[in-house]
């Protein structure tokens, strides 16, 4: 029987900049039953306080609600397991919730071909962005990117739209079933998972860009 | 209308106890961070205790220590403080506070009028 | 315990002029921390300036917030009737305290 080994915060991520959740991952329990504390100061603060929600994020987890999240405030957190035998602590880690934001992916993705008379045929997306993002505010800035592949094929065309939430594509093999799908990004942060897979049929009948 | 209202005040003599009651309306109580603040006459601000939204760890200023005891109860909107063992030197105009955000230590932005303790013999 | 120290104590002023206030702490203090107060006679105390300076919902302009370290400052611009009051700057970077108080009264 020995005291825990030492825990690690291993990722820090927040859907909207309003809330965020830290997980850790235990070390060695020692043979005995651990218990698990986050305790966290914001900089420049000489207070410690513990995590106010350890339950919304699942297992190890610290939730950190509308009430604890501050912008432009950096946390610093460490995690305490503690058995019988004694206690150990992980790093101090330091969390800017600006960079830790992973948004939920885009929204509503239709996809159409168009065939104007005058102009050749071309496919044209559509999304919006997703709800927990207020745009609106100008706290964020959201960039999108876009992969399809026809359906029995292994590798993926991406593009990149920037700030727009439609696009077209011109080059698409006619006669085939495209996979398309889009996903978002904060100017600063991670990409969001990639939405589901909306399926267009090209016609036979479509032409070729040059 | 976003307010606090204090209760429980009144005169006691030293050794004894009160307890002071505090509710809120017009906001989401469980958002804040609340504390007591108290101004004796004459004087100037001081922090007695308070805690975080969720009612976590509590806090108190070192003259209260082991006589006061700060409560709250989300569900009813209501922020409590149990004084035992008064004293000449508590005497004075109780604030019930509110922090701007879910700490406790925070600017406090919203006060409510005060109920007066008094502790005399 | 971070001790706040206010100055001047009072402060003599004419309406219509500029107030300079200072709070000078007993250690730095990191500047998210610090708030101001306004506490007209009779009244419960109000919250001017966060964060060294930002200013509270429904501050007018006139009052603005600076300062780092050790030494803040809270100015007035044009003093209106109901300025003259007791200012008390306040840390909650640690357990909270008060200053003592700037008195602003009419010359």
């Known amino acids: 029987q020995l005291p825990p080994g030492k825990p690690e915060i291993f990722k820090c991520r927040s859907p909207n900049k309003e809330t965020f959740t830290c997980w850790w991952r235990p070390g060695t329990d020692g043979g005995l039953p651990t218990n698990y504390s986050l305790t966290y100061h914001r900089e420049g603060e000489t207070l410690m306080h513990e995590c106010p929600d350890y339950i919304t994020g699942g297992p190890n987890s610290c939730h950190f609600g509308k009430q604890y999240t501050s912008m432009w405030r950096t946390y610093v957190m460490m995690v305490n397991a503690t058995n019988q035998m004694g206690s150990s602590f992980s790093d101090e880690l330091y969390v800017d919730v600006t960079y830790i934001v992973q948004p939920d992916p885009p929204l509503e993705l239709t996809v159409e071909v168009k065939q104007p008379e005058d102009r050749k045929p071309y496919l044209w997306m559509k999304w919006s962005p997703p709800t927990l993002i207020d745009l609106k505010t100008g706290w964020f800035t959201l960039l999108y990117e876009i992969r399809l592949k026809p359906e029995k094929a292994a590798e993926w065309e991406t593009h990149f739209a920037g700030q727009q939430t439609e696009f077209k594509i011109l080059s698409l093999h006619p006669g085939q079933k495209y996979l398309v799908q889009v996903r978002c990004k904060p100017d600063h942060g991670y990409w969001s998972a990639w939405s589901p897979a909306t399926f267009i049929q090209i016609p036979s009948d479509f032409i070729m860009n040059d | 209308e976003v307010q606090l209202v204090e209760s429980g005040g009144g005169v006691v003599r030293p050794g004894g106890s009160l307890r002071l009651s505090c509710v809120g309306s017009g906001f989401s109580f469980d958002d804040h961070g609340m504390n007591w603040v108290r101004q004796g006459p004459g004087k100037g601000l001081e922090w007695v205790s308070g805690f975080n939204w969720n009612g976590g760890s509590t806090n108190y200023a070192e003259s209260v220590k082991g006589r006061f005891t700060i409560s709250r109860d989300n569900a009813r909107n209501s922020l409590f403080l149990q004084m035992n063992s008064l004293r000449a030197e508590d005497t004075a105009l109780y604030y019930c506070?509110?922090?701007?955000?879910?700490?406790?230590?925070?600017?406090?932005?919203?006060w409510g009028p005060g109920t007066m303790v008094t502790v005399s013999s | 315990e971070i001790v706040l120290t206010q100055s001047p104590g009072t402060l003599s002023l004419s309406p219509g002029e500029r107030a300079t206030l200072s709070c000078r702490a007993s250690?730095?203090?990191?500047?998210?921390?610090l708030a101001w107060y306004r506490q007209k006679p009779g009244q419960t105390p109000r919250l001017l300036i966060y964060?060294?300076?930002s200013r509270a919902t429904g501050i007018p302009d006139r009052f603005s917030g600076s300062g780092s370290g050790t030494d803040f400052s809270l100015t007035i611009s044009r003093l209106e009737p109901e300025d003259f009051a007791v200012f008390y700057c306040?840390?909650?970077?640690?357990?909270?305290?008060f200053g003592p108080g700037t008195k602003v009264d009419i010359k």
């Open positions: 250690q730095t203090i990191n500047s998210n921390y």
């Open positions: 964060g060294t300076s």
């Open positions: 306040q840390q909650y970077a640690g357990l909270p305290t």
């Open positions: 506070v509110r922090g701007r955000s879910g700490w406790f230590n925070d600017a406090f932005d919203v």
